[in-house]
């Protein structure tokens, strides 16, 4: 018979032969042969593999570093990685939660809609037309553009969501 060019699900092709993949939680020790099945071994303590695989090494569980404010939310198994979260009152910097911040800042062009609490992080909102923020802040709202008219001045440079308008003197008509 012709050697296979593709294999079924949960199999892999090696040496013109379809071998079974190792199940989640196990790593590959040796490929199958004409006479033997794929040999797999369970991952060790603090290791995991979360897919059907042909990996020869298991992945290390994530370490929730207390020096970064992290703690274990869910302990890893042979099939799943450890899930970290932040100490109470702190917030993850990303979905992967690799470090913690007290709260995040709103970038220039954004203002603070709601200051962080122990439960929720800072909520930012874009500065609408007529308002700006030129700083990164965890408490400052968007500021309204300066009104040149009330100062008897004219707009010399338009404002943006990150910059205030620039006012200047009105052109005096010559006699």
């Amino acid at each position: 018979p012709e050697p296979p060019t593709a294999c079924r699900e949960k199999q892999y092709l090696i040496n013109s032969q379809c071998c079974s993949l190792c199940q989640p939680g196990q790593k590959l020790v040796s490929d199958c042969t004409e006479f033997t099945e794929t040999e797999c071994l369970p991952c060790g303590e603090s290791e995991f593999l979360d897919t059907w695989n042909r990996e020869t090494h298991c992945h290390q569980h994530k370490y929730c570093d207390p020096n970064l404010g992290l703690r274990v939310q869910q302990k890893g198994t042979s099939e799943t990685d450890t899930i970290c979260t932040c100490e109470e009152g702190w917030h993850c910097t990303s979905e992967a939660c690799e470090s913690c911040v007290l709260h995040r800042s709103c970038s220039p062009g954004f203002g603070v809609k709601q200051i962080a609490t122990g439960v929720s992080d800072t909520i930012c909102e874009p500065c609408p037309v007529g308002f700006f923020s030129n700083v990164s802040s965890a408490f400052e709202k968007c500021h309204p553009w300066t009104s040149c008219e009330t100062k008897d001045l004219v707009v010399q440079q338009a404002g943006t969501n990150k910059t205030d308008v620039v006012c200047g003197p009105q052109d005096r008509l010559r006699a």
Epitope: N67, L68, S99, C100, V101, L102, S105, S137, E140
Partner: nanobody
Amino acid sequence: EVQLLESGGGLVQPGGSLRLSCAASGFTFAGYEMWWVRQAPGKGLERVSAISGSGGSTYYADSVKGRFTISRDDSKNTLYLQMNSLRAEDTAVYHCAKEPYSYDYWGQGTLVTVSS
């Protein structure tokens, strides 16, 4: 290495005053937004007060408004919190924090105890 060292805490009677300091080193202090955050025994973190990098804008939690004043002296790389009319509920460890507010910038804090 960024370091924030809080001082000025102590035992004070209700109605008394204290001035906390936060000495900053390892970074250019001027221009950084700074916060005072406190943690009462067995309670969560409470954001007390903040000051903008320029010193022109400030924020106060409702619980301290009219009693506490935040200020900064960029020439001394120091943040201050003047606390007047202290109450028992102000008892906490007070920490200062700098942007980007990472956990590894978090100092030991200074303990304020308000009791008669």
